[in-house]
């Protein structure tokens, strides 16, 4: 209209998608009567009547807004429900009396995008690529207006950099009118980027102000050539025979090269390839001293066919040889002396110990054991232990049996055994001497003999308890080239008066056993009575 003042800027109303926009007609009473107003939407310069107010009563016009408009605030405000991105336009109210005036409102619509979805290049990136390679993609769905994307590496924003960093973004409009932003980060990476953390950030606006959403952080598989290969041995520290040893090749490249492990042949000095498992690990199990030697690893890059060799590594599998004792089978007369000497080889300094086999008592620390004024009790086992003190568990032993010439020596001279008539009795008799004696019984029964050690024998007799047997008792006789000796077993019937209140009254076999190295006891499963020690 000629002479009319320039139109003032429209009032700004900001709302989120899905909420209700309150469009307040800002005409003053002097500019128009709010009981008679027309509302228009303006889209691409075209006005469309959407709502009429007459005598304070509102009426929607047919069309896209028909179901979403209502009057509020005594007719001064038009409420638009379920706002969509398509509602971002100018709305105006026009008063009819006293003269036509209008008031414009700019509706701005916002919607936060969904969490940004980051996807890293699943195939990885070589450091020697000719141009920036695709590192990761970022998708921000259903935002309005279009959010802005910022890419970060190790917490620092990435800027476009010619031939180094390129960010390519595009957006698509969904049928809802919302935007989906897609962005791809292209970069030339270096070896140090193998641990770099990348993420993308979406910046967007809401009526409440500026906001942002961050994706999760990702690392990118970075491929770089191998510069160095080396060997690693497990376990670390001193190795010993019998250990499980793993020798593996390592490289500082990604992907690692094809590995092979070689050992130098000590006689030819040639490197001979060893057989590794599927993981390229050489497993020595059990490790032997022959595994000691010089190992090296070769890494072959199958792309460039460049081969790299590791520093050689000396592997030492520590060992202790078989232990030799001299004399190997000593025989001595009572009262004489004996010197036992122990020898062994090792890759380390050895420590020797002599122990009595039967008791485990340490007799000597050193390779030589001297025994003087030998008694028959000195007969039996002596063990030499050769060990490496610096390597726990690395030791070898040898047992030697010392024989003292002498007639049979009984574990007990006489013994009382409690029995029941008509029971099968299990009796045992033990003797020692050199040469080893044999045992005979004075009664008929089933006898079996067992060699306990080179000087000791145990005979077991199964016999039925009869009145005659109770009368005579049982004798066992041990004999060798140097003499004989006898033990007597007295049999006594169990009756009620011989049982004590705490005694065990279960029935079963009666046994009588004794040993020269233990207290001689007569045992019966029905009654246990200690006996005084008796030796022949």
């Amino acid at each position: 209209v000629p002479g009319e003042a320039e139109q003032p800027a429209p009032e700004l109303v900001e709302v989120e998608v899905g909420s209700t926009a309150l469009l307040k007609c800002g005409l003053s009473q002097s500019q128009g009567n709010l009981s008679h107003v027309d509302w228009f939407s303006v889209h691409k310069e075209k006005r469309t009547l959407i709502f009429r107010v007459r005598q304070g009563q509102g009426q929607s016009e047919p069309g896209e807004y028909e179901q979403r408009l209502s009057l509020q605030d005594r007719g001064a405000t038009l409420a638009l429900t379920q706002v969509t991105p398509q509602d971002e336009r100018i709305f105006l109210c026009q008063g009819k009396r006293p003269r036509s005036q209008e008031y414009r409102i700019q509706l701005r619509v916002y919607k936060a995008p969904e969490e940004p979805n980051i996807q890293v290049n699943p195939l990885g990136i070589p450091v020697n690529s000719k141009e920036p390679e695709e590192v990761a993609t970022c998708v921000g769905r259903n935002g309005y207006p279009i959010p802005q994307v910022i890419w970060y590496k190790n917490g620092r924003p990435l800027k476009e950099e010619k031939n180094r960093v390129h960010i390519q973004s595009s957006q698509t409009v969904e049928s809802s009118g919302l935007y989906t932003l897609q962005s791809i980060l292209k970069a030339q990476l270096v070896k140090e980027d193998k641990d770099a953390q990348f993420y993308c950030e979406l910046n967007y606006r809401l009526p409440s102000g500026n906001h942002m959403k961050e994706s999760r952080e990702v690392t990118v598989p970075v491929f770089y050539p191998t510069e160095k290969v080396w060997l690693e041995v497990e376990p670390v520290g001193m190795l010993k025979e019998g250990d499980r040893v793993e020798i593996r090749c390592l490289a500082d490249g990604n992907p690692p090269p094809h590995f092979s492990i070689s050992k130098q042949n000590p006689s030819t000095r040639e490197a001979e390839e060893e057989t590794t498992n599927d993981n390229g690990v050489l497993v020595l199990e059990p490790a032997r001293k022959e595994h000691s030697g010089r190992y090296e690893c070769q890494g072959l890059d199958l792309d460039t066919m460049i081969s790299l060799l590791s520093e050689p590594q000396e592997l030492l599998v520590n060992y202790v040889s078989d232990v030799r004792v001299s004399p190997a089978a000593p025989e001595r007369q009572e009262g004489s002396s004996l010197t036992l000497t122990c020898e062994a080889e090792s890759s380390q300094d050895l420590e020797f110990q002599w122990l009595r086999e039967e008791t485990g008592q340490v007799l000597e620390r050193g390779p030589v054991l001297q025994l003087h004024d030998l008694k028959r009790e000195a007969g039996g086992g002596y063990r030499c232990v050769a060990s490496v003190p610096s390597i726990p568990g690395l030791n070898r032993t040898q047992l030697v049996n010392v024989a003292i010439f002498g007639p049979p020596w009984m574990a007990f001279k006489e013994r009382k055994v409690w029995v029941k008539e008509n029971m099968v009795l299990n009796l045992s008799c033990e003797a020692s001497g050199h040469p080893r004696p044999t045992i005979s019984w004075n009664v008929n029964g089933t006898a079996s003999e067992q060699d306990q050690d080179p000087q000791r024998v145990l005979s077991t007799l199964n016999v039925l308890v009869t009145p005659e047997l109770l009368e005579t008792g049982v004798e066992c006789t041990a004999s060798n080239d140097l003499g004989k000796n006898t033990s007597i077993l007295f049999l006594e019937l169990v009756n009620l008066t011989t049982l004590t209140p705490d005694s065990n009254t279960t029935t079963g076999l009666s046994t009588s056993t004794a040993s020269p190295h233990t207290r001689a006891n007569s045992t019966s499963t029905e009654r246990k009575l200690p006996e005084p020690e008796s030796r022949g």
Epitope: N117, Q119, P122, I125, S129, E131, E134, T137, V139, S170
Partner: antibody
Framework: QVQLKESGPGLVQPSQTLSLTCTVS????????VSWVRQPPGKGLEWIAA???????YYNSAFKSRLSISRNTSKSQVLLKMNSLQTEDTAMYFC????????????WGPGTMVTVSS | DIQVTQSPSLLSASVGDRVTLNCKAS??????LAWYQQKLGEGPKVLIF???SLQTGIPSRFSGSGSGTDFTLTISSLQPEDFATYFC????????FGAGTKLELK
């Protein structure tokens, strides 16, 4: 519209080399990466190799030593060479376009059947 | 390598049925998963990417869900043209495909 078409010899002798060509239209090889994927008769899909929009090549480590992928951007072709073929390499060979803003395959060719037999 | 396991391998259903296909990854792949449909004598066709995003032009009866190691493709109301083989594919580390689920008419 986006199209990919595989071509190859059909029949290959064991121990020979296979050469396959993927001819594309509707997009540029400098904008989208292309992969080769194969499918033995009645079996699942197996990714073989890829060439990125920047020209970087990638291979399935199971075949790496006998594969070569390359491209001719002016002819809009991606080439795959596979040597030392065995009967178990008999399969339908597909080329597929990688979506520009993702890592999945948004367009595939119809495939070409390769039979390894003497 | 990441393994991808699909179940069931064979699924019989009728037109109008709601069906669910499963895919399990051997390790966490976040949402780096796509679903493909393959009909006899054709190349695969992408249905779903990023685990739950519907590819342009694919009917809305197809939907994807899941994250981490367990994923699902749902067809809300089977149509005659949906009988085919369905593959899932992980693209978190390298590319590996499931063995497929064949969806057949009951």
């Amino acid at each position: 519209q986006v199209q990919l078409k595989e071509s190859g010899p059909g029949l290959v002798q064991p121990s020979q080399t296979l050469s396959l060509t993927c001819t594309v239209s509707g997009f540029s090889l400098t904008s989208n990466g292309v992969s080769w994927v194969r499918q033995p008769p009645g079996k699942g899909l197996e990714w073989i190799a890829a060439i990125s929009s920047g020209g970087t090549t990638y291979y399935n480590s199971a075949f790496k030593s006998r594969l070569s992928i390359s491209r001719n951007t002016s002819k809009s072709q991606v080439l795959l060479k596979m040597n030392s073929l065995q009967t178990e390499d008999t399969a339908m060979y597909f080329c597929a376009r990688r979506y520009g803003y993702g890592w999945y395959f948004d367009f595939w060719g119809p495939g070409t059947m390769v039979t390894v037999s003497s | 390598d990441i393994q991808v396991t699909q179940s069931p391998s064979l699924l019989s259903a009728s037109v109008g049925d709601r069906v669910t296909l499963n895919c399990k990854a051997s390790q966490n792949i976040y949402n780096s998963l796509a679903w493909y449909q393959q009909k006899l004598g054709e190349g695969p066709k992408v249905l779903i990417f990023n685990a739950n995003s519907l590819q342009t032009g694919i009917p809305s009866r197809f939907s994807g869900s899941g994250s981490g190691t367990d994923f699902t493709l749902t067809i809300s109301s089977l149509q005659p043209e949906d009988f085919a083989t369905y593959f899932c594919q992980q693209f978190y580390s390298g590319y590996t495909f499931g063995a497929g689920t064949k969806l057949e008419l009951k």
